[in-house]
């Protein structure tokens, strides 16, 4: 049978997921009822490896499979007829896939800093790269991240700076190719803590009786994450600016003469049973010298006559030695420490004094 | 295919509002960053504000602040913005836009916004 | 805010001429730098994004290059349908800033 040439295809229309483009086209032909189509996909910058899809006669629609996300493809369409007649010219469109989603990502906190940790492995396919989105209340940040490669299964990670502490953040990042957005991939993370910021204040410090104090003070504030405890530390020496190692310190040690300073008390502030809020600052009053005990502190009575100067340490993180039941391991507590408080004299031991002035 | 149509422009006095509208088909809309982007008559192209995917963070120039705000309503695909305390400055072609790593990929074929007394 | 400075203002090309417009940024943009084509009456047209990746569809004569601080567009084998204005664009620090155009015409 004699055939005339098929004109070209035009209008091809494509639409795209990660792996498939369905493809469809028009021959506006009388005889278009007896072609059939030739395909020839080709990823850009790969000629040598082209993809052939023939189609039955009269189907103008193609789903071609197997496509890597992300990335960009030449279609070309033949209309033939007969014993392979073909139009002159392919119609041709370019498209590209669409860009796979971060399957997920984690967070890390970074130690006693205000900052997080991303880590992913590239998705499948083609990137240009990544949107990045972090948010918390009405604070927002936008920014790009550079593209990966997902052939060796590298994980891949970037740091977020310049956050608070004790923070949760909702985060969120999409994979970007040839000018289309996949989903976002989202999580929540919350930073880590450090250090509390030391209050500007010292505590108050008031005699009660010739053995006993009263020490107030004031909570610490929580922005570089919640207060967990307070230890209160008194000093008969020069009130220098106190260390962690203080914390070491029992009541025995000072009756022994092994240091002029030590722990006389300890709060745990979950034992409060109230959630402290950011901005809410609670007030404490300690006795001191009352015998009670808290862990390994021995809340001890004091010395008549003595001079004492009261300081407090707050913590973030609070941890205790594991041989030294009950004190507190400085090294590798979150603490900071107030000024210490103006000395305060106590009275002499009247009941002492009356008996001696008899004999 | 992706088609982005603008609404809502038109004339209006100094210190007035408009509301444009940005209807978009052809792609996820809820996946995309947006932006629009204005054209003073026979002026180059300014940057107007932007519009995040996940939590519709919105970012604006400094001369738009405190009197345009973007947003989104992603169940319609459609792409707002709300002019407040219009100016002259502030007559142009208004476009939306696609802002996939800050490039305007696809844009809409614009709406005339003219402040005028 | 960082500044865009495109050169030439305008430019006039032969038929099959090779031009070329450059664009620079007043701080480094991580080649985070696209150009796009705008005729009379029309919206603009993304050529190239991330310094140098055509866009879809877009010719092959069109091409990008540079970094940090420097970019340009090349145009091959000029086209009487590659008159229009060309625009560079930052998108690496808000405000996202755009060149003040480069007006290309064929002689």
């Known amino acids: 049978a004699q055939y005339t040439r098929p004109s070209n295809v035009s209008n091809i229309d494509v639409s795209t997921n990660t792996t498939a483009a369905t493809l469809s086209w028009q021959n506006f032909d009388d005889a278009s009822p007896t072609y059939s189509y030739c395909l020839l996909i080709e990823k850009a910058g790969n000629s040598s490896n082209a993809t052939q899809v023939v189609t039955d006669i009269g189907i103008t629609d193609a789903t071609v499979t197997e496509l890597i996300p992300g990335s960009s493809y030449t279609v070309e369409i033949f209309a033939q007829v007969g014993d392979g007649i073909k139009s002159l010219e392919p119609g041709r469109k370019s498209f590209c896939t669409d860009p796979a989603s971060m399957a997920s990502f984690d967070c890390e906190v970074v130690p006693k800093e205000p900052a997080l940790v991303l880590k992913w492995t590239c998705p499948p396919g083609a990137n240009a790269g990544f949107e990045l989105e972090v948010s918390s209340g009405a604070w927002n940040n936008a920014t790009h991240l550079e593209s990966c490669s997902s052939e060796n299964g590298t994980e891949y990670r970037t740091e977020v700076t310049y956050l608070n502490f004790s923070t949760s953040y909702n985060i969120s990042i999409t994979t970007v190719s040839c000018g289309k957005m996949a989903a976002p991939t989202r999580n929540t993370c919350t930073t880590g803590i450090t250090d509390p910021p030391p209050p500007d204040g010292s505590p108050n410090i008031t005699s009660v009786s010739h053995n006993s104090v009263k020490v107030k003070f004031s909570g610490f504030e929580a922005s570089h994450g919640p207060i967990k405890a307070y230890a209160v530390i008194l000093t008969t020496g020069e009130a220098g600016h106190p260390s962690a190692d203080v914390l070491k310190y029992t009541y025995e040690d000072f009756k022994k003469g092994a240091s002029d300073t030590y722990v006389t008390y300890l709060i745990r502030t979950e034992e409060k049973g109230r959630s402290q809020s950011l901005s809410e600052v609670l007030k404490y009053e300690i006795d001191v010298g009352n015998e009670s005990t808290t862990l390994g502190y021995y809340n001890g009575k004091l010395e008549p006559l003595g001079s004492y100067r009261a300081c407090v340490a707050g913590f973030t993180n609070i941890t205790f030695h594991p041989q030294n039941k009950g004190l507190i391991d400085g090294a590798e507590s979150y603490v900071s420490f107030s000024r210490y408080s103006d000395a305060v004299s106590l009275p002499q031991d009247v009941a002492a004094a009356h008996h001696h002035h008899h004999h | 295919e992706v088609k982005l149509v603008e609404s809502g422009g038109g004339l209006v006095q100094p210190g007035g509002s408009l509301k444009l509208s940005c209807a978009a088909s052809?792609?996820?809309?809820?996946?995309?960053?947006m932006a629009w982007v204005r054209q003073a008559p026979t002026k180059g192209l300014e940057w107007v504000a932007y519009?995040?995917?996940?939590?519709?963070?919105?970012y604006y120039r400094d001369s738009v602040k405190g009197r345009f705000t973007i947003s989104r309503d992603n169940a319609k695909s459609t792409l707002y913005l709300q002019m407040d305390s219009l100016r002259s400055e502030d007559t142009a072609t208004y476009y939306c836009?696609?802002?996939?790593?800050?490039?305007?990929?696809?844009w809409g074929q614009g709406t005339l916004v003219t402040v005028s007394s | 805010d960082i500044q865009m400075t495109q050169t030439p203002h305008s430019l006039s090309a032969s038929l099959g001429e090779t031009v070329s417009i450059e664009c620079l940024a007043s701080?480094?943009?991580?080649?985070?730098l696209a150009w796009y084509q705008q005729k009379p009456g029309k919206s603009p047209q993304l050529l190239i994004s991330h310094a140098n990746p055509l866009h879809d569809g877009v010719p092959s004569r069109f091409s990008g290059d540079g970094s940090g601080t420097q970019y340009s567009l090349k145009i091959r084998n000029m086209q009487p349908e590659d008159e229009g204005v060309y625009y560079c664009?930052?998108?690496?620090?808000?405000?996202?800033?755009f060149g003040a155009g480069t007006k290309l015409e064929l002689k």
């Open positions: 836009s696609t802002v996939p790593l800050g490039a305007f990929v696809y």
């Open positions: 052809g792609f996820t809309f809820s996946n995309y960053y």
């Open positions: 519009i995040t995917n996940s939590f519709g963070s919105a």
């Open positions: 701080e480094g943009i991580s080649n985070y």
């Open positions: 664009q930052q998108g690496y620090k808000f405000p996202y800033t």
